[in-house]
Amino acid sequence: KEEQISFRDCAEVFKSGHTTNGVYTLTLPNSTEEVKAYCDMEAGGGGWTIIQRREDGSVDFQRTWKEYKVGFGNPSGEYWLGNEFVSQLTNQQRYVLKIHLKDWEGNEAYSLYEHFYLSSEELNYRIHLKGLTGTAGKISSISQPGNDFSTKDADNDKCICKCSQMLTGGWWFDACGPSNLNGMYYPQRQNTNKFNGIKWYYWKGSGYSLKGTTMMIRPADF
C-alpha cells in the first residue's frame, strides 16, 4: 500500500523535491482538511507559502469573517489563504512573514518580519510580529503591538468607527492604522487620495493605493 505524503507548507513541498512555482495541496498535521496554496519556489531561496495576493482587482476582498477564516479567491491569482489555517500553522513552529509590494511606477519593496503568528479564532486572529527589516519602511505599517482581525461583520478594531466597513476588506485594523492590504483595488491614475485603497503608509505614504501585494510565510529555520 502506497503511503500518502502530505505537506503542511510550501517549505515541506520544496524539501520534498518539488521546486516549481505553482498551486499545491497542503494539510496540517493530524488533520484531514486540505487547502490549496500557491508556493513561490524561486524568491529568496524558495519554500514560501503565499497567504495573500493582490494583482488586478479581480477578486472582491470585502468578505465576511467566515470567508476570511476559511479563505477565498484563486490561489493562482488574487486570494486569501485563510486565517484558521495560518493560525494553526504559525502556532506549530516559528515562521517569518515577508510582504512584497509593487507601486504603479515600477518600484518594488518588501517588509520582512523575523517572527509572525496569528492567535486563535477565540482571540480574533490577533497578529503578532517581531523584528522588522526591509525596504518598505523602517517603521511597521502593521500597527504594533498587533491588533485583532476585523471584517465587515466583525468589528474588533480600536476605532469609534467600523474600520472594515469604512476602508473595506478584512485586516488587523487599529483606528484604522497605517496599512490595509485588503482594501479596494484602484487602477493606475485613479490610485491617489484614496481613503479605502491598498495602503502601506511607511513606504508610499497616505492615500496611495498599490498595484500589487503578496504576503508569504516560511519556517524561520528553512
Epitope: C159, C161, M166, A175, K194, F195, S206, G207
Partner: nanobody, 129 residues
Amino acid sequence: EVQLVESGGGLVQAGGSLRLSCAASGFTLDDYAIGWFRQAPGKEREGVSTIRDSDGSTYYADSVKGRFTISSDNDKNTVYLQMNSLKPEDTAVYYCAAVPAGRLRFGEQWYPLYEYDAWGQGTLVTVSS
C-alpha cells in the same frame, strides 16, 4: 474624485498676515476633518491645525496657538487658515489634508498623520525678517 487645492501663500514680512484657503471637492466637510500641515526644508511634516465640522472641534499646535485661526465655510466646501503675527520660523510649504471624521481611536480627539489619506499639492509661505 477627491481633490484638495491650497491657495493664498506668498512672501510676507515678519509680523504680517496671510490667509490660506483649502478648497475641497469630491466629498463634503460635514463628514471629514481637515488638517493644515507644514514642511520646512529639511524638516519633517508637522501638524499645524485641524477642524472637525461635525462637532465644531479645533486643534492647534502649541507653536501657533493665539496666532493662527482655522475656520470653514460649508457652502464653499473650503477651510481657511488665518495666520497673524507671522515669524520667519513659519516659513514652509503648507498643505491641507482630509481624514474621515469618525476615524478616531476610542478616547482620543485627534488623528495621527497616517490617517490623512487625501492631500493637496501645497502652497509656499515665506516670512522674511
